[in-house]
Interface confidence: low
Amino acid sequence: LEVSESPGSIQVARGQPAVLPCTFTTSAALINLNVIWMVTPLSNANQPEQVILYQGGQMFDGAPRFHGRVGFTGTMPATNVSIFINNTQLSDTGTYQCLVNNLPDIGGRNIGVTGLTVLVPPSAPHCQIQGSQDIGSDVILLCSSEEGIPRPTYLWEKLDNTLKLPPTATQDQVQGTVTIRNISALSSGLYQCVASNAIGTSTCLLDLQVISPQPRNIG
């Protein structure tokens, strides 16, 4: 018995179905086929879980969180024992193992391993200003999304005809910050933060209004 090499890693957007491949060759009839799928979740590597089991001609549910969402892609028994997971959740991310036994064929590699990463687009980011908006001050524009896998990067742009940040601005796309030093009237305007990752983007807007000093009355 020999389980074929798997693609190694699969990525899927949250809520979408995933297919985890596992096929094998065997010299024996599929009378005593026994297949177990296990997962070592990324979120809890110390607690491997059973996903689905095929034994004695019957299918058995694994961990409760997979109930109703998991099944074999084809009619069993078969040499293709790939499974699908519907409505993928973030907690489904992990390392999946298919373990195949088909007595009396007991030689060879009986395990296939596939990594599953459930991707999440960035949630609507939160934009805010830190610091005084008085002319000549330094301000920091902050942007962050609660969710996003892989971790989003953040791009700030000023919504004017140039889409460029003021020359005194420095941007950190990982942290989602823009520091604008020595703000002036020209710094005023609408700023947009674009949070993006491999499967989506999301934006927020921020209105920066630089406050000029009030003229003092004489006399």
């Epitope: 070592t40 030689g107 391993v113």
Partner: antibody
């Protein structure tokens, strides 16, 4: 036939180190997870550690975490247990066991004869 | 960690009698993740039951497992002379894997 033979046990002083080996034969070693289980004299069984077939996943009992390291060399069909900072309470017969083919979390049918580790000053 | 408590500590019975061994978990164990082992003096343990009720290969059908949640039972329907030994339950649903303290089945 399946054989598991442990070696490396003996008498060692507290705080010292010891490395146990388990030589496997009669099956495709690289396809099976392997466990270490110990049994103190006259006491019950205590699971120590497990390693997945390719060595990518390892789990330990709290009592040995940070002191013991399970590893394997599939090219040599050998399982290892590196035991550091040994304590008197680590005195036990140490068994290696092959996981069940259908569930690698189950210790399975096949166990070695055990090797005795005595930690004493 | 999940603590398993076995009872009774010792069971004195005669060959041909029925043996009922109990294993209680401190927290719920998925029935897919409980095993029973037999150990005779000077020997390594032997897997009898896994998944709470699935007999391991080569295990006689006089051995049966049942239970779910926190209460599990190993039943030996008719004791044979070779069944007198120590029996351990073990959970493998959460790390660390843990064993019960054992039940000794001895000849009355």
């Amino acid at each position: 036939q399946v054989q598991l033979v442990e070696s490396g046990g003996g008498v060692v002083q507290p705080g010292r180190s010891l490395r146990l080996s388990c030589a496997a034969s009669g099956f495709t070693f690289s396809s099976y997870a392997m466990h270490w289980v110990r049994q103190a004299p006259g006491k019950g069984l205590e699971w120590v550690a497990v390693i997945s077939y390719d060595g990518s996943n390892k789990y330990y009992a709290d009592s040995v975490k940070g002191r013991f390291t399970i590893s394997r060399d599939n090219s040599k069909n050998t399982l290892y247990l590196q035991m550091n900072s040994l304590r008197a309470e680590d005195t036990a017969v140490y068994y290696c066991a092959r996981a069940s083919p259908s569930q690698w979390l189950v210790l399975g049918h096949y166990w070695g004869q055990g090797t005795l580790v005595t930690v004493s000053s | 960690e999940t603590t398993l408590t076995q009872s009774p500590g010792t069971l004195s019975l005669s060959p041909g009698e029925r043996a009922t061994l109990s294993c209680r978990a401190s927290q719920s164990v998925s029935s897919s993740y409980l095993a029973w082992y037999q150990q005779k003096p000077g020997q390594a343990p032997r897997l009898l039951i896994y998944g709470a009720s699935s007999r391991a290969t080569g295990i006689p059908d006089r051995f049966s497992g049942s239970g779910s949640g926190t209460d599990f039972t190993l039943t030996i329907s008719r004791l044979e002379p070779e069944d007198f030994a120590v029996y351990y339950c073990q959970q493998y649903g959460s790390s660390p894997w843990t064993f019960g303290q054992g039940t000794k089945v001895e000849i009355k």
